[in-house]
């Protein structure tokens, strides 16, 4: 009985370690202050785990503000860059590729690239310098590599269920039997819940990759990691869809979970995350 013989696939190279900050002020949000100057400064973004530009008003604000990118990196970054799990087939996109262009709330004027799901192409946009979402790339090349489609418009799985690359929908057939799945969603979905460094008690949700469920946790208000969602639905959208079915010819097919009216699904093989 194949169900009894368990294979334990240990994810080692895609696991994102919990964010460990060198200084607690690196967790502060970018604060432009109440003044009206327009000064280019840098801050450490705990969500992208990178130092980024923002526009500083010239007074007050907080310590997460640096004159140069180098100074910011020196004070706040370690060698634990956020890695995106790349899918085997080009058309298998991380879920953030489908997010809308989001300039964020800051007043910077930074050229970035985003994947436009309407045109199916990566396009330029102006990023404010803080917040926004993960559909935000420094180079056109990076955006294309991660989000643009490969040569094939769709794949067909071994049950005859057609996956349409245009809308990522599955055409339902009948009750399905299990197949091997791998996780190819955003890497932070595999990280443990992290309360962060502050003292608030905010209700948030995180994706528990051991059980495949979004669960509530208390967030301290700062720090932590990207596995942090304000609603259960947002958590499910971001993390529960990133499973790829490995088919017999070595290709991969993405199935979208949590779609309305979806009646037919395919089961998932266990994936273990080291040190969870």
């Amino acid at each position: 009985d194949s169900e009894e013989d368990e294979e334990h696939t240990i994810i080692t190279d895609t696991e994102l370690p919990p964010l460990k900050l060198m200084h607690s002020f690196c967790a502060f949000k970018a604060d432009d202050g109440p003044c009206k100057a327009i000064m280019k400064r840098f801050f450490f973004n705990i969500f992208t785990r990178q130092c980024e530009e923002f526009i500083y008003g010239g007074c007050e604000g907080n310590q997460n503000r640096f004159e140069s990118l180098e100074e910011c990196k020196k004070m706040c970054t370690r060698d634990n860059a956020n890695r995106i799990i790349k899918t085997t087939l080009q058309q298998e996109k991380p879920d953030f590729c489908f997010l809308e262009e989001d300039p964020g709330i800051c007043r910077g004027y930074i050229t970035r690239y985003f994947y436009n799901n309407q045109t199916k192409q990566c396009e330029r946009f102006k990023y404010g310098g803080c917040l926004g979402n993960m559909n935000n790339f420094e180079t056109l090349e990076e955006c294309k590599n991660i989000c643009e489609d490969g040569p094939n418009g769709f794949q067909v799985d071994n049950y005859g269920t057609q996956l349409n690359a245009v809308n990522n929908s599955l055409t339902p057939q009948s009750t399905k039997v299990p197949s091997l799945f791998e996780f190819h969603g955003p890497s932070w979905c595999l990280t443990p819940a992290d309360r962060g460094l502050c003292r608030a008690n905010e209700n948030r949700f995180y994706y528990n990759s051991v059980i495949g469920k979004c669960r509530p946790f208390k967030y301290s208000g700062c720090g932590g990691n990207e596995n942090n969602f304000t609603s259960k639905q947002e958590c499910l959208r971001a993390c529960k869809k990133g499973f790829i079915q490995r088919i017999s010819k070595g290709g991969l097919i993405k199935t979208k979970r949590k779609r309305k009216k979806q009646r037919v699904k395919i089961a998932y093989e266990e994936i273990f995350v080291k040190n969870m």
Partner: antibody, heavy 118, light 107 residues
């Protein structure tokens, strides 16, 4: 082969406590959450709670918060459930079951019958 | 707490007949429903897991459908070995909750 071996039947007096065990084998113990389910004679199933064997974190059904305590011993790959202040309402078969991500409760222990009687 | 209302509580069906069991959930659980079969003296056996997914080794006469709050479990061409209790379980929200069960007998 995955196996969940539960401890034997218990006959206990009202007001007493009992500790049930569920020994896991055939898989990486800390990689799966373990759950407990109650079934009174001739009745339906009731979810008691879950334990994460890797760190001992638990979630209990509100109804069982003052009744059940879940613990784990990683060295012996065993989870325990202690039931306290027993009454006749606690007479039931108690199952441990493993949660498989996206598959559900595929593997179950054989059940432990607890009879509370003076 | 998410409540699960299962119907009917009991059901008599002739061999070869079609059995339909329904579970209504008090909140939207997407497709996080599971269906179990339990025979006397045995633990429950998972037939269909989240997403209306038939488990390995389970005969194809068993199926399920539904999304959100309304779910249906079906046995086509009932056999004598299908006599058992059947339960649905919602695994979307804590605490997980079972339906009250359906006792299936032969007519």
């Amino acid at each position: 082969q995955v196996q969940l071996q539960q401890s034997g039947a218990e006959l206990v007096k009202p007001g007493a406590s009992v500790k049930l065990s569920c020994k896991a084998s055939g898989y990486t113990f800390i990689s799966y959450y373990m759950y407990w389910v109650k079934q009174r004679p001739g009745q339906g199933l009731e979810w008691i709670g879950e334990i994460n064997p890797s760190n001992g974190d638990t979630n209990l059904n509100e109804k069982f918060k003052s009744k059940a305590t879940l613990t784990v011993d990683k060295s012996s790959s065993t989870v325990y459930m202690q039931l306290s202040s027993l009454t006749s309402e606690d007479s039931a078969v108690y199952y441990c079951t493993r949660w498989d991500r996206f598959d559900g409760f595929v593997y179950w222990g054989q059940g432990t019958l607890v009879t509370v009687s003076a | 707490e998410t409540t699960v209302t299962q119907s009917p509580a009991s059901l008599s069906m002739a061999i070869g007949g079609k059995v339909t069991i329904r579970c209504i959930i008090s909140t939207n659980i997407d497709d996080d429903i599971n269906w179990y079969q339990q025979k006397p003296g045995e633990p429950p056996k998972l037939l269909i897991s989240e997403g209306n997914t038939l488990r390995p080794g389970v005969p194809s006469r068993f199926s399920s459908s539904g999304y959100g709050t309304d779910f249906v479990f079906t046995i086509e061409n009932m056999l004598s070995e299908d006599v058992a209790d059947y339960y649905c379980l919602q695994s979307d929200d804590l605490p997980y909750t079972f339906g009250g069960g359906t006792k299936l007998e032969i007519k």
